[in-house]
Amino acid sequence: QSGPLPKPSLQALPSSLVPLEKPVTLRCQGPPGVDLYRLEKLSSSRYQDQAVLFIPAMKRSLAGRYRCSYQNGSLWSLPSDQLELVATGVFAKPSLSAQPGPAVSSGGDVTLQCQTRYGFDQFALYKEGDPAPYKNPERWYRASFPIITVTAAHSGTYRCYSFSSRDPYLWSAPSDPLELVVTGTSVTPSRLPTEPPSPVAEFSEATAELTVSFTNEVFTTETSRSITASPKESDSPAGPARQYYTKGN
């Protein structure tokens, strides 16, 4: 074969957001018949020559960016996309509130506000059943996530995290859940908490909609202001890991 071998995939199971002391398995998947896998933690000298890293109990020191590659004969593959393994529960939980309130009429506006008593400058909001959190960098003690023109799809359970840009893989515990209820519509939410996440959500800067490919990374975008997600069909498998999508401000 000419040229580099295709990149493998790297997954965190059951999730890439891992509470301290909980288990997680990183799994590198290449084509059948691979001679050797290498899984490495970036910005460190840690690596192992096997496809699976099992962590029985998550520690702060294990949070960070990981990638893997494989070797067939003398050829090495391209590296996998980076996986961001986040330790949660490192700091006390923030509070999440809805302005003007958690019950909103279809077509109305609502702002979800994540607030912490610490001086964190980063916040992440996620909705149960969605593939990744929205991230929102702000230099104060709280972050606002406006939802413009609410639809039934915005109904659901939300939580937020806070963290520092100095330690971007060490997050707080999740806030208590906030149930957003959209009234005046009979349409059911687009995703239920028990369903697997939809593979792709879209983003277009012009309409301030979110687009994130379905992978195991936590993405950050810096421009989006609304959290309207529109699912699209994809061949990507919605595996057992619960994924998260991100948002900047």
Epitope: P14, P19, E21, K22, P23, F54, P240
Partner: antibody, heavy 119, light 107 residues
Framework: VTLKESGPGILQPSQTLSLTCSFS??????????VGWIRQPSGKGLEWLAH???????YYNTALKSRLTISKDTSNNQVFLKIASVDTADTATYYC????????????WGQGTTLTVSS | DIQMTQSPASLSASVGETVTITCRAS??????LAWYQQKQGKSPQLLVY???NLADGVPSRFSGSGSGTQFSLKINSLQPEDFGSYYC?????????FGGGTKLEIK
């Protein structure tokens, strides 16, 4: 894969219980393998006590942690559990069982050894 | 610690019937849950791992389902050898607590 527990059978209150799990068919030096201890008072449910992984990571039942010590002898295929200062409430059948991380379950169990604590 | 609440504590059923045992976790444990069967005077035996996967040698009349906090074990067309006690157990971070058990008796 087989596991077999051994213990003293009868102890008096305040004594230390020493249990041994001898196993064959797998090695505790294999990545992702662990052995745990579970007990069951007669007619009651199962209670997880302690666990040791291939890399010597050890985990304990929260309520009993101060009394438990788990260890292993990899070369002799043995895992040990000590319970300090036993009481009549520790009367139970004690099982050891294997965990392989991939299945996240106790996939093989020993036959159990019975302990009676009586003065 | 994560609590596992199993129900019912006991049930009576006849050979050929279908029964379902449920297990509820006090917090999200994803699919990191196992089911065991224990017969009188014997060691527990693994039935289901990772919530839905049948262990080797387990008959297909057994099935596990659920994820997150709600799980169930279903036994179709009960056979005489299925009577005994059943336990769920989570493995999502220690302590690895068991459910209280369900005693399945012949009606």
């Amino acid at each position: 894969v087989t596991l077999k527990e051994s213990g003293p059978g009868i102890l008096q209150p305040s004594q230390t219980l020493s249990l041994t799990c001898s196993f064959s068919g797998f090695s505790l030096s294999t990545y992702g393998i662990g052995v745990g201890w579970i007990r069951q008072p007669s007619g009651k449910g199962l209670e997880w006590l302690a666990h040791i992984w291939w890399n010597d990571d050890k985990y304990y039942n929260t309520a009993l942690k101060s009394r438990l010590t788990i260890s292993k002898d990899t070369s002799n295929n043995q895992v040990f559990l000590k319970i300090a200062s036993v009481d009549t409430a520790d009367t139970a059948t004690y099982y050891c069982a294997r965990v392989y991380y991939y299945g996240s379950s106790f996939d093989y169990w020993g036959q159990g050894t019975t302990l009676t604590v009586s003065s | 610690d994560i609590q596992m609440t199993q129900s019912p504590a006991s049930l009576s059923a006849s050979v050929g019937e279908t029964v379902t045992i449920t297990c509820r976790a006090s917090e999200n444990i994803f699919s990191i849950l196992a089911w065991y069967q224990q017969k009188q005077g014997k060691s527990p035996q693994l039935l289901v791992y990772a919530a839905t996967n049948l262990a080797d040698g387990v008959p297909s009349r057994f099935s596990g389902s659920g994820s997150g906090t709600q799980f169930s074990l279903k036994i179709n067309s009960l056979q005489p050898e299925d009577f005994g006690s059943y336990y769920c157990q989570h493995f999502y971070g220690t302590p690895w607590t068991f459910g209280g058990g369900t005693k399945l008796e012949i009606k």
